[in-house]
């Protein structure tokens, strides 16, 4: 807290300008009018105040707006945003995408801070859903943003917003998140032709069920091994050797290198060795000839 002292004669700030960088903290407190600061916030970002000076300016705004800053001030906070706490930000009502962009720009190149996370949360809640423009903006600044959301939060993403998602935005998503996103992607891209559809849906396939993988295997998609390895194990297990061969096309040879890893390992254990041998890859571990395969899960469902 800065002590209340009278402003020295001739030091009263008539405008927010660069000469204020020389003001001691108590001089800033005494000589800068909070209302003047609020109306000229756009200038603050261009002036190289020290962090301690920014603390004083923040304190002045806090006194002027105890219930939270208006958006006209928030939009021009610039570096002062780095001084805000999540508690400060929870008082704000941010509705403009331009304001959001301006503040994310300040934090650009850094990890998502608690302040930024709170800001995004306030913004998205205010909008009611993650619309395409918002998602576009957020993933541009934070490629991992989408995967930081819970499945419940992802359920509010409209299918139309999926067009904004890039493959790298999904890199850190887990299967539960992809389970939510995949049906939305399927809906979003449903009117595209085969090859274009596969290019778009590929990064979401970690949430695809068996029947969709079977359908893809009929379309000459040539799925790469990296994508195959991210598929749900329970979705891959029912696929036949012929279906996997069609699904992977020329990439089927890559199965040998992955035979010890899931889902390939578990899938091999479910196939007849005879069928695996038709691939000519030397895959081992399938069911020997003459053995009967009982699907216990089906048996349990019937009883």
């Amino acid at each position: 807290e800065v002590e209340k002292t009278a402003c020295p004669s001739g030091k009263k700030a008539r405008e927010i300008d660069e000469s204020l960088i020389f003001y001691k903290k108590w001089e800033l407190e005494a000589c800068v009018d909070a209302a003047l600061l609020a109306t000229q916030m756009d200038r603050v970002n261009a002036i190289p105040f020290t962090y301690e000076q920014l603390d004083v300016l923040k304190h002045k705004l806090d006194e002027l707006y105890p219930q939270g800053y208006p958006e006209s001030v928030i939009q021009h906070l610039g570096y002062l945003f780095l001084k805000m706490s999540p508690e400060d930000i929870r008082k704000w009502n941010v509705t403009s995408l331009e304001t959001l962009k301006a503040l994310l720009e300040v934090n650009k190149g850094h990890e998502m801070s608690p302040q930024v996370a709170t800001l995004i949360d306030r913004f998205v809640k205010g909008r009611g859903q993650l619309d395409k423009d918002t998602l576009d903006t957020l993933t541009a600044f934070y490629p991992g943003y989408l995967c930081s959301l819970s499945p419940e939060e992802l359920s509010s993403v409209p299918p139309s917003s999926i067009w904004a998602v890039r493959p790298q935005d999904l890199d850190t998503c887990d299967p539960r998140q992809l389970d939510v996103l995949y049906p939305k992607a399927r809906l979003a891209f449903q009117n595209m032709n085969g090859s274009e559809y596969f290019v778009k849906i590929q990064s979401f396939l970690g949430g695809a069920p068996t029947e969709d993988l079977k359908a893809l295997s009929q379309q000459n998609v040539s799925m790469d091994l990296a994508t195959f390895m991210k598929l749900r194990t329970d979705a891959v297990l029912p696929l036949t050797v012929a279906e996997v061969q069609k699904l992977l096309g020329p990439h089927v040879e890559g199965l040998k290198a992955e035979e010890r890893h899931r889902p390939v390992r578990d899938w091999i254990l479910r196939q007849r060795q005879d069928d695996l041998d038709t691939l000519g890859l030397g895959l081992q571990g399938g069911i020997p000839n003459g053995y009967l395969v009982l699907d216990l899960s089906m048996q349990e469902a019937l009883s």
């Epitope: 300008d17 660069e18 000469s19 960088i21 020389f22 003001y23 001691k24 903290k25 800033l28 190289p48 105040f49 020290t50 962090y51 301690e52 000076q53 920014l54 570096y79």
Partner: nanobody, 127 residues
């Protein structure tokens, strides 16, 4: 790397004038701030006058109206014109330049903010 060299100090009578010069070299753009500090025996170094990269000026209360800070961009030189000198102006005067990219320090009135310093020039005012 910025080099800063002061000149112009000396011994004068109270009421007289002096002009200090601060020549900087080693860079093509103006630092964020150039400032004149002074340090009297047994006292802390204090800001006398400051000049921003845009030409805005600042003066400490003790010299306001008597001292003028200015610069000549062509010569990369900052001046401190000192008029109506008083006995209490006696000190070593230092020129400082600062770029402060990480905004450390308390304010630009604090010597800790400046990266580049001259060796100082002695100003003695006799009464």
């Amino acid at each position: 790397e910025v080099q800063v060299v002061e000149s112009g100090g000396g011994l004068v009578q109270a009421g007289a004038s002096l002009r200090l010069s601060c020549a900087s070299s080693g860079r093509t753009i103006s630092p964020i701030a150039m400032a004149w500090f002074r340090q009297a025996p047994g006292k802390e170094r204090e800001l006398v006058a400051g000049l921003t990269w845009t030409g805005r000026t600042y003066y400490s209360d003790s010299v306001k109206g008597r001292f003028t800070i200015s610069r000549d961009n062509a010569k990369n030189t900052v001046y401190l014109q000192m008029d109506s000198l008083k006995f209490e102006d006696t000190a070593v005067y230092f020129c400082a330049a600062g770029d402060n990219p990480d905004r450390r320090g308390s304010s630009w009135s604090s010597s800790s903010v400046y990266e580049y310093w001259g060796q100082g020039t002695q100003v003695t005012v006799s009464s």
